[in-house]
């Protein structure tokens, strides 16, 4: 029975050339988190494994940093980084929980953070 919910940083924006922290939090379940995947579309950015720690995909090593916590830091942002990002929590015994974050990378110096929201 999957009872958990994922809270994410929601719709966020950041300046071109800057950095942003993507964060998700799983609550309302006692399931054990075995691994968290960070994905952009169908591309794997990074993995945080309970056993083995962090693994950053080779193609993103220069611009992705692990943390804080189970979150992910994107650096040297470009307009091409605009889009959907997903945190996938692999848990036992519940299974898979997915959270969505939409990032907009702005040319201007004004980047406002969106509201937090929940995905059941």
């Amino acid at each position: 029975m999957m009872t958990g919910t994922i809270e994410t940083t929601g719709n966020i924006s950041a300046e071109k050339g800057g950095s942003i922290i993507l964060q998700c939090h799983l609550s309302s379940t006692t399931a054990q988190v075995t691994q968290v995947n960070w994905e952009q579309q169908d591309q794997l950015l990074a993995i945080c494994n309970a056993d083995l720690g962090w693994h950053i995909s080779p193609s993103f090593k220069d611009r992705v940093a692990p943390g804080p916590g189970l979150g992910l830091t994107l650096q040297s942002l470009t307009v091409n980084d605009t889009g959907e990002y997903f945190c996938i929590y692999h848990t036992y015994p519940d299974g898979t929980y997915t959270g969505r974050i939409f990032l907009e990378v702005l040319e201007s110096s004004v980047a406002e953070h969106g509201a937090r929201f929940q995905i059941p």
Epitope: T34, P93, T96
Partner: antibody, heavy 119, light 107 residues
Framework: EVQLVESGGGLVKPGGSLKLSCAAS????????MSWVRQSPEKRLEWVAE????????YHPDTVTGRFTISRDNAKNTLYLEMSSLRSEDTAMYYC????????????WGQGTSVTVSS | DVQITQSPSYLAASPGETITINCRAS??????LAWYQEKPGKTNKLLIY???TLQSGIPSRFSGSGSGTDFTLTISSLEPEDFAMYYC?????????FGGGTKLEIK
């Protein structure tokens, strides 16, 4: 080339025990979670155990909990399945399989080892 | 547990044809369904995972679609080596469960 080679199967009486092994090669064994899956004589597939890459976390379905134990020796690149209190319904071909690094599905399987539980 | 119903259990087709195999889950499994090919004397091969993602090295004539409870494996322009047993498996929640299999034979 990724290779998984199972061994240790055989004929065992009901209530008996058996320990299966799976020798892995061609990849960094400790980086991957591993599973055991069995296939009944009727060709039904059933997941029976999983272990995390470092061996800290193990998972079993209710059908085998308390009877089957999965373990691994990363120094020897070997996966194990210790089976006790065996029943006739445990008769199957047992496969070890590697989980994808992203935890989606099992990307490599062994050729299997046969276990027959019969008096 | 999530029950997976796979259909048909048997399918006869000719090389060059396009076929579809279906799997239905007893409840939503999001996109998390995998497809495997089983052939005598060979190890099981992962074809598709997460519903539609093609495993590296698998020919593009294999494709997967669906989400929620209904999923389809399509093999277009069947090649002689495609005649085999096919299984689906949900990887959304424990315990992982499989469909009953589809035997694809040459007509």
């Amino acid at each position: 080339e990724v290779q998984l080679v199972e061994s240790g199967g055989g004929l065992v009486k009901p209530g008996g025990s058996l320990k299966l092994s799976c020798a892995a090669s061609g990849f960094t064994f400790s980086n991957y979670a591993m599973s055991w899956v069995r296939q009944s004589p009727e060709k039904r597939l059933e997941w029976v155990a999983e272990i995390s890459g470092g061996g800290s976390y193990t998972y079993h379905p209710d059908t085998v909990t308390g009877r089957f134990t999965i373990s691994r020796d990363n120094a020897k690149n070997t996966l194990y399945l210790e089976m006790s209190s065996l029943r006739s319904e445990d008769t199957a071909m047992y496969y070890c399989a590697r989980k994808r690094r992203d935890y989606y599905a099992m990307d490599y399987w062994g050729q299997g080892t046969s276990v027959t539980v019969s008096s | 547990d999530v029950q997976i119903t796979q259909s048909p259990s048997y399918l006869a087709a000719s090389p060059g044809e396009t076929i579809t195999i279906n799997c239905r889950a007893s409840k939503s499994i999001s996109k998390y369904l995998a497809w495997y090919q089983e052939k005598p004397g060979k190890t099981n091969k992962l074809l598709i995972y997460s519903g539609s993602t093609l495993q590296s090295g698998i020919p593009s004539r294999f494709s997967g679609s669906g989400s929620g409870t209904d999923f389809t494996l399509t093999i277009s322009s069947l090649e002689p080596e495609d005649f085999a047993m096919y299984y689906c498996q949900q990887h959304n929640e424990y315990p992982w469960t499989f469909g009953g299999g589809t035997k694809l034979e040459i007509k």
